[in-house]
Every structure is written in C-alpha cells, then in structure tokens.
Amino acid sequence: AITEAREEAKPYPLFPGPFPGSLQTDHTPLLSLPHASGYQPALMFSPTQPGRPHTGNVAIPQVTSVESKPLPPLAFKHTVGHIILSEHKGVKFNCSISVPNIYQDTTISWWKDGKELLGAHHAITQFYPDDEVTAIIASFSITSVQRSDNGSYICKMKINNEEIVSDPIYIEVQGLPHFTKQPESMNVTRNTAFNLTCQAVGPPEPVNIFWVQNSSRVNEQPEKSPSVLTVPGLTEMAVFSCEAHNDKGLTVSKGVQINIKAIPSPPTEVSIRNSTAHSILISWVPGFDGYSPFRNCSIQVKEADPLSNGSVMIFNTSALPHLYQIKQLQALANYSIGVSCMNEIGWSAVSPWILASTTEGAPSVAPLNVTVFLNESSDNVDIRWMKPPTKQQDGELVGYRISHVWQSAGISKELLEEVGQNGSRARISVQVHNATCTVRIAAVTRGGVGPFSDPVKIFIPAHGWVDYAPSSTPAPGNADPVLII
C-alpha cells in the first residue's frame, strides 16, 4: 500500500502585540489586495513565530522626527521555513512585515528560485493599519501542488530603493517516484550484450530500482537510482520494465520490447510497372525488415523460355525506392524475376517469381550483304540483301525500308520504298541518268525501324552504256564505294 507523507509545518505566532496570530482570527483586515484571482485552498499554514536569527535583508530607515529616535530596521518576520506535503494537496504560506505609516506605496512581490512570480498565481496582500505602523501580510496559495511547485519561495519589498527580502520558505512536494529516464525499446543482435537505463527521483529520496524481464524480477536486491541493467544477450524477444520505489510507494515504467535482429522477410508484390523492348521496370513491397534497416536489394532475372539456356542475371541496387529498371534484356522475351533484400544480419529469401515480358523493339542491326546493280535493259536498279539475325530482329519482321538517294550535278533527292517481309530483293526504277544512286536498307518490325545499312553507291550512266558488275556493301573499314559503269 502507498503510505501518505506527513504534512509538516512549524507554527509560530505571526506578530507580537495587537496583530493577529493567524489568518483564521476574527480580525478583519482593512484592505485586501489580491495579486491574482483565485479561490483560497482548504489547507492553510499559519504564519510563524519569531525567534530564529533573521537572514533576510533589512532596510534601516533614515527618517527621524524631532521628538523620536530613529525608526527600527525593517524586516520580514520569521515564518515557516519548510513545508512538506503530498502532490495534489493545497498549501498556503505567508510573509508578514510591519511598516511605519510614513512609507507610502509599499508592494510585496513573490519570487521562486530567483524568478519573480507574475501572472495567474494565487497571491493576496492584506494590510492591517494601526496608529504608527501597518502590518502587511502577503499570502501565497497553491490549490493542487505539483512537483514543479517544489522550490524556495521568498517575498521582496522595496522601500526607499532598498530591497527587503524574507527568509526562504522551502516547499517540498512529495509523491511516488517520478521517472526522469526510462528504458528504451531496442533492436539487438542475438546473444550480444546491451544496457538499459532507468532513473527516477523523489522526493522523498532515496529511490530504489528493481528490474523486470517478462514479468519476473531480475534483481533480488534493489539498486539506488539511477540504475543500469546489463543484459548479457537474448535469443528471443523480451519485454523489460523497471520499478521505482520510495517511501510513498511504487511507480512502474513503461514496458519496452527488446527485439532480436533477424534476416528480413522476402519482398512481396513484385510487379511490372513498365516494359520496353530491352528493359523492364519493376517495383516491390519490402518484407518485414527483421528489426534492422534494409541496406540493399538484389534482382535476379532469368529467361523463362523453354529453349533458353540463358544464364542468370543479378542486379544490385539500393533498398530505396523499391523500384528498379532491369536493362540489357532481349526483345520479345519472357523473364522470371525475383527480388531479395538485405539488412545487417543477412539476405532475405527471394520473393516469389513473377513473369515479365519485353515488348517488340525496332531491329538492332541492319540487313546484311546489301548488293546493288543496274539492269540497263529494264532501266531498273536491282537490290539484294540478307535479313538480320533472328536474335537481333527484336520482333517480328514486317518488312524493309529502302532509302535511295539520287545525286547529279548538285541536285539531290531521296526516295523511300517499303517492301514486304518475305522478300530479300527489290527493284527500283532509275530516276536520273548520269547520276550516283546511294542505297541503304533498314529492317522494320512493329517496334519500329532499325538502323540503316552502310550506304552502297552505284553510278547510273547516260543511255547506251554497258551493264557492268554489281556494287556491294563494303567490307568493314572500306568507306563509300562507288561503282562506275
């Protein structure tokens, strides 16, 4: 059970002579000045008796009258020095001083731990005038004390530019231990030592700490706060908390989970965002990270066609942004794709495979062995070629595009012809005589037009010349062949 702290105050009579001994008398003050609005608390501490040496500041008035001695030094009367009470209780304490009536406009301010208390505090000043002096009682009340109200309170009064300071009144709010540092959740490596810290304060002190693991106490003897628990290592997740004990009772910290770092779970929902002829953009949802941040991911790709003997391709990438463009793929091919990711402990398994296909692309190579010759009898140019290798067609051939450029005496014109996919030869009409014809051929798929072959040139003579040998695609390194017939 939690025991209640005692409420301590040392009562002393407030004033000698005609002034009231406590605020609960029948003596009605002449004037009451509240510093701030607020109700009076149920619990009031009586002002206290003189008798101890006075430590507050004293002002010595210089004013004297013809028939009197100098006025005695001004000082706050002694009051209660230390108040101990429990949290949420009410408290009221006072400062009192007798001021000769010759002083006008005296005000009392309250200070806590060196800072003036302004604003909405429950402070009231009461004036009790007499023939020669006015007794001033400044009361300060707190309706429900918190730990933050702990501290040293003083009154200050200014007279003739002199500051009079009361003895301090120490307020000590006692309660259950209050945590200033609680254990934190952690992700730890299996069988590796780690520390947890717990710190709690009163008052009242001392505060003792017990550690709890999975609902069982770890230490038989309590440790004085602050306490550091060294855990030699865990093999499975555990929940730790600490108990803080003082004379008021016990407070339990939040329970914190200590997780064991593990390899991540495989990514899920690998999906195709976009496909081109030679690339596939994939995304994935990372799996559980195993209580350790992902570092990077690996994408495994293999051609999924039954006849393919293609090797496995592995692409490494950063863990973010869960997106990767797989490049250097073949057009019109099927691929199985999987993703795995790693953290500091190791790699996840590969995600379940997904099937992805590249689209048709434009051919990546030009037709081979292009040959051009003049058939003078029909006034045509015959063109022959070999289709590009199937692997480099990057799709289904739909035909060929033939570019033929005619140049004569500074005049140049280009014409384009389309031919069907079955052919490997074409015939074009001679456009200009006494001219050079330059021919280039490109393969065409639904994915687009591939690169044009190297140019092959043939000279078309004026009418009546003899038909000579054909012109062909040059061997590598031979540029710009011209056959003059």
Partner: antibody, heavy 117, light 107 residues
Framework: EVQLQQSGPELVKPGASVKISCKTS????????MHWVKQSHGKSLEWIGG????????IYNQKFKGKATLTVDKSSSTAYMELRSLTSEDSEVYYC??????????WGQGTTLKVSS | DIVMTQSHKFMSTSVGDRVSITCKAS??????VAWYQQKPGHSPKLLIY???TRRTGVPDRFTGSGSGTDFTLTISNVQSEDLADYFC?????????FGAGTKLELK
C-alpha cells in the same frame, strides 16, 4: 548435365538429429535457389524451405521452423538439411529440388528417413 | 497459406484418350503454377510452368491452361507412359504449396 545427388537412407532414434546432403553438378551452384520438400505416405508434397547459395537468404515454411535447418557449402556445391528432435512423424522421403525460376526443374533422387527406437 | 485442391485423387483413362486434371487455388495465384509428373519410385519431374509453358523435352500432348484460381493440365492422346501421379504447385506466395496429387490409371 544437371544432377542433384542426395545422401543415402537414414535410420535414426527418436530425439536424435540427422543431416541430409544434396551434392550438385552440371550448373553454377550459386545461381539457383535450393528447396527441400517432404513427401508423406508416398503421396502429398510439402515444401520445407529454400536457401539461396549466393547470399544465404533462407526462408522456411513456418511448420518446419525449429525442425529443419538449411545450409550450403559453396566450395563443394552441396546443400544440407538438418532435421532435429526426430519423431516417427518425420519418417518420410525428403527431396532437394533446384528452383528453375519458375518451378522446381531438377530434383534429387530422394532420401528415405526412418525414425525408430 | 494457399491451398491447392486437386479434386480427383484418381482418374481413369485409356490409351489414346484425352484427360484433364484440374487444380483449384484457394486464392488468386496469377499464372504462377507448375505441374509435375511422378512415377512410382522416382522423383517428381517438371512438365509445365507459368501455367502453360511446356518444359523443353516434354511432349506436346501435355498442355496447361488457366489463371487466377482455376488451372488445368490436359493430356491429349494419353500414352501408357503417362500413367503416373500429377501434382500442381503454386509459387505465387510463401509458403509454396502443392496439390495432393491426382493418380492417372488405366480403366
């Protein structure tokens, strides 16, 4: 030619452990995940788990977590499965199977395990 | 876990017949389904993957079809060497699972 050669039949006592091996040849060991499958009563197939020899990423069927431990030895291109705390229910045929990226394209010949006192 | 249900434990057929073995997934598995053939005393052998792609060397009388939750392995012109157990297998999500198998036997 791709081959998966498993260790021979095992007769062990209840409570003991056993380690079955699967030696591979004919392909690059680190490029393909190796799975293990249990076949009960000569019929139904149950996936135990898989290991990626390239990076040692492992995944287990929850049902076999704590029962099976998968490892590999890259230097000998061999995969291993250790089964512990054996009971009569573990007396079945166990296969290693290569993940061809779209199903298990090559299987070992199977290892028969008999648990008996 | 995804359950793969092969409703027929046994199917009777004659040589030359056409037979369809079905498999139903308890949830959508896309096209991530493979089919295996297992003969007594042997390891399973991959026939079909990605639902309908025939593995190299597998006779073209074996065809796979379906998507989502319903899948079929069809053997047209059944041969005596086709008499075996057939298993479907989903690899769409972990844990990977298999059907209980369908035994193809002669009438």
């Amino acid at each position: 030619e791709v081959q998966l050669q498993q260790s021979g039949p095992e007769l062990v006592k209840p409570g003991a452990s056993v380690k079955i091996s699967c030696k591979t040849s004919g392909y690059t060991f680190t490029e393909y995940i190796m799975h293990w499958v249990k076949q009960s009563h000569g019929k139904s197939l149950e996936w135990i788990g898989g290991i990626n020899p390239n990076n040692l990423g492992i995944i287990y069927n929850q049902k076999f977590k704590g029962k099976a431990t998968l490892t590999v030895d890259k230097s000998s291109s061999t995969a291993y499965m250790e089964l512990r705390s054996l009971t009569s229910e573990d007396s079945e045929v166990y296969y290693c199977a290569r993940d061809g990226y779209f199903g298990f394209d090559y299987w070992g010949q199977g290892t028969t395990l008999k648990v008996s006192s | 876990d995804i359950v793969m249900t092969q409703s027929h434990k046994f199917m009777s057929t004659s040589v030359g017949d056409r037979v369809s073995i079905t498999c139903k997934a308890s949830q959508d598995v896309g096209t991530s389904v493979a089919w295996y053939q297992q003969k007594p005393g042997h390891s399973p052998k991959l026939l079909i993957y990605w639902t309908s792609t025939r593995r190299t060397g597998v006779p073209d009388r074996f065809t796979g079809s379906g998507s989502g939750t319903d899948f079929t392995l069809t053997i047209s012109n059944v041969q005596s060497e086709d008499l075996a157990d057939y298993f479907c297998h989903q690899y769409n999500s972990y844990p990977l699972t298999f059907g209980a198998g369908t035994k193809l036997e002669l009438k």
